[in-house]
Interface confidence: low
């Protein structure tokens, strides 16, 4: 029976050209987390296995860094980053449960409160 | 209006510590998450840790171990512990609201020297 959930940061906003951190946590289950997936429509971003680390699809690379935690940080965004992102943990015995996230570029202009930081 | 306040800031030899202090209002602080982020003069801001409602915590591997993020929900206030700092934890540190990190503070200088 799985009884765990997935919390989120749910629905964002960010500027273009900024960054931002995607983040999920998995609560209120024992399960063991075996990997989780980030992926962006159908595309995969990255994978953090438990034992073999973090693996960033080649395409994504230069714009895409691991973490914090289980987390994503996308960089230098663009408008056409904008969609639905979905973080899916992989585990032992529940299953898979599956976080979703609306992530909306806005140009810099629209964006008043956009993030501005960067991870080093 | 959302306002988030920072404090705690000072100068503190190499190896001390220091708590920082950020007051949110204007927004449901136990349902939203809260980040520390640090800018050192002439560098770009970078994050630092997070906090997510139920007291869930993320950090920068440069602090890990030695930074605690925390968070009193019925004092609407996040906290930095900062221990065992080092000169290169120099820097102008700002807490910002979560989600997107959409508001700012507008931060406390820590420096660290002897």
């Known amino acids: 029976m799985m009884t765990g959930t997935i919390e989120t940061t749910g629905n964002i906003s960010a500027e273009k050209g900024g960054s931002i951190i995607l983040q999920c946590h998995l609560s209120s289950t024992t399960a063991q987390v075996t990997q989780v997936n980030w992926e962006q429509q159908d595309q995969l971003l990255a994978i953090c296995n438990a034992d073999l680390g973090w693996h960033i699809s080649p395409s994504f690379k230069d714009r895409v860094a691991p973490g914090p935690g289980l987390g994503l940080t996308l960089q230098s965004l663009t408008v056409n980053d904008t969609g639905e992102y979905f973080c899916i943990y992989h585990t032992y015995p529940d299953g898979t449960y599956t976080g979703r996230i609306f992530l909306e570029v806005l140009e810099s202009s629209v964006a008043e409160h956009g993030a501005r930081f960067q991870i080093p | 209006e959302v306002q988030l306040v920072e404090s705690g800031g000072g100068l503190v030899q190499p190896g001390g510590s220091l708590r920082l202090s950020c007051a949110a209002s204007?927004?449901?602080?136990?349902?939203?998450?809260m980040g520390w982020f640090r800018q050192a003069p002439g560098k770009e801001r970078e994050w630092v840790a997070s906090?997510?409602?139920?007291?869930?915590?993320w950090y920068a591997d440069s602090v890990k171990g030695r930074f605690t993020i925390s968070a009193d929900n019925s004092k609407n206030t996040a906290y930095l512990q900062m221990n065992s700092l080092k000169p290169e934890d120099t820097a102008v540190y700002y807490c910002?609201?979560?989600?997107?990190?959409?508001?700012w503070g507008q931060g406390t200088l820590v420096t660290v020297s002897s």
């Open positions: 906090v997510l409602r139920g007291g869930y915590t």
């Open positions: 204007g927004f449901a602080f136990s349902s939203d998450w």
């Open positions: 910002a609201r979560g989600e997107g990190f959409d508001y």
